[in-house]
């Protein structure tokens, strides 16, 4: 029962988080910036990993993809990759550990083949958080290192002065959502390699029960079992479940060097 | 680099009218104000008139009502049709522009100015 809702938890925790690091991919706000009251008009100006968007105190917004600009900076292009590879391995990890979950039956599949695909969707979502939380704060750090920040300087051209305009730019909220979306995902995936230990099969080692006849003849256990005196009991049994409690009797045993033939 | 070519400069009688044109070219992104700004010798630079990308236009007081600002996005062009001009309005009158130019990269571009002269 632990293990099923430690799972179905997991699997929660993860979609909650891989919807959140789609969000914060998509959304425009990873960095936002006051330009400064123009004598025009008051611009606000936010930016993403796909476009720059600028508004207006009239409240008139106009955006722009990047595909127009020429020379991207290297360090953007890892973040989009990052966050990409991250909604990747998520999207996957959440199509396993659907078919991994305990709660769901699908043909004749046995716990160990969930315990795998559980274990996968697991590493799966480690990744994908690990993934988002490290493309989150490379952009960030590209805005504490004043990366996005020009320095206020004057140059003359054959077009006349250039003036660059002295912007700080400040964490948007798109880097809070991806720092949580990737943290929950993390979460989520630690929880579904615990559930996967729950599932797999496990070998136990039971107290040994040993039939003592009279003399030298040998005791048989019942179910039509090997033979094995009461020195050497195979005390490895192995557990095998099929979705049913059995007791240990009904354990299959196998054979140790000391059964007979 | 942003460049401006201003044009439409020259002499004019008082009462005549004049159009200025500033058209931006080079590395731009996304240009998010354009204005004319005057300057007369012996004082500050002041706004004549500015217009942003969603049509929010702004005069300079002496100038309302006579001057008008108009802008061609696609082309990046502003042009500034002055009309009634007075003695006072002469000035060397410079384009401004603020461009996105990139990602975190933020310009005020400034043209070489055009003299305009009423006498």
């Known amino acids: 029962m632990a293990v099923t809702a430690c799972q179905g938890l997991g699997f929660v925790v993860s979609l909650i988080g891989i919807a959140g690091i789609i969000a914060a991919t998509c959304m425009d706000q990873w960095s936002t910036q006051d330009l400064y009251n123009n004598p025009v008009t008051a611009v606000f100006n936010y930016q993403g990993l796909w476009r720059s968007c600028v508004r207006e105190s009239s409240g008139f917004t106009e955006c722009r993809g990047y595909f127009t600009l020429l020379g991207l900076p290297a360090m953007l292009q890892a973040v989009r990759a990052l966050m990409i590879v991250g909604i990747v391995l998520g999207a996957i990890g959440l199509l396993v550990s659907i078919f991994a979950l305990k709660c769901i039956r699908i043909g004749s599949m046995e716990d160990s083949a969930k315990a795998n695909m559980t274990l996968t969707s697991g590493i799966m979502f480690i990744v994908s958080g690990l993934c988002a939380i490290a493309g989150v704060s490379v952009f960030a750090n590209m805005l504490v290192t004043n990366f996005w920040m020009s320095t206020a300087n004057m140059y003359t051209g054959m077009g006349g002065m250039v003036q660059t305009v002295q912007t700080r730019y400040t964490f948007g909220a798109a880097l809070f959502v991806g720092w949580v979306a990737g943290g929950l995902t993390l979460i989520g995936g630690v929880m579904m390699c615990i559930a996967c230990r729950g599932l797999a099969p496990e070998e136990t080692n039971y107290k040994a029960v040993s039939y003592h006849a009279s003399g030298h003849s040998v005791a048989y256990k019942p179910g039509g079992f090997k033979a094995s005196t009461g020195f050497g009991s195979n005390t490895k049994n192995k557990k095998i479940y099929d979705g049913g409690a059995r007791t240990e009797d009904e354990v299959q045993s196998y054979p140790s060097k000391h059964d007979y033939v | 680099q942003v460049q401006l070519v201003e044009s439409g400069g020259g002499s004019v009688q008082p009462g005549g009218s004049l159009r200025l044109s500033c058209a931006a070219s080079?590395?731009?992104?996304?240009?998010?104000?354009m204005g004319w700004y005057r300057q007369a010798p012996g004082k500050q630079r002041e706004l004549v008139a500015g217009?942003?990308?969603?049509?929010?236009?702004n005069y300079g007081d002496s100038v309302k009502g006579r001057f008008t600002i108009s802008r061609d996005n696609a082309k990046n062009t502003v042009y500034l049709q002055m009309n009634s001009l007075k003695p006072e309005d002469t000035a060397v009158y410079y384009c401004?522009?603020?461009?996105?130019?990139?990602?975190?990269?933020?310009?005020?571009?400034w043209g070489q100015g055009t003299l305009v002269t009423v006498s």
């Open positions: 401004n522009v603020l461009v996105i130019s990139g990602i975190g990269s933020h310009l005020e571009v």
């Open positions: 080079g590395s731009i992104f996304h240009i998010v104000v």
């Open positions: 217009m942003s990308t969603g049509g929010t236009t």
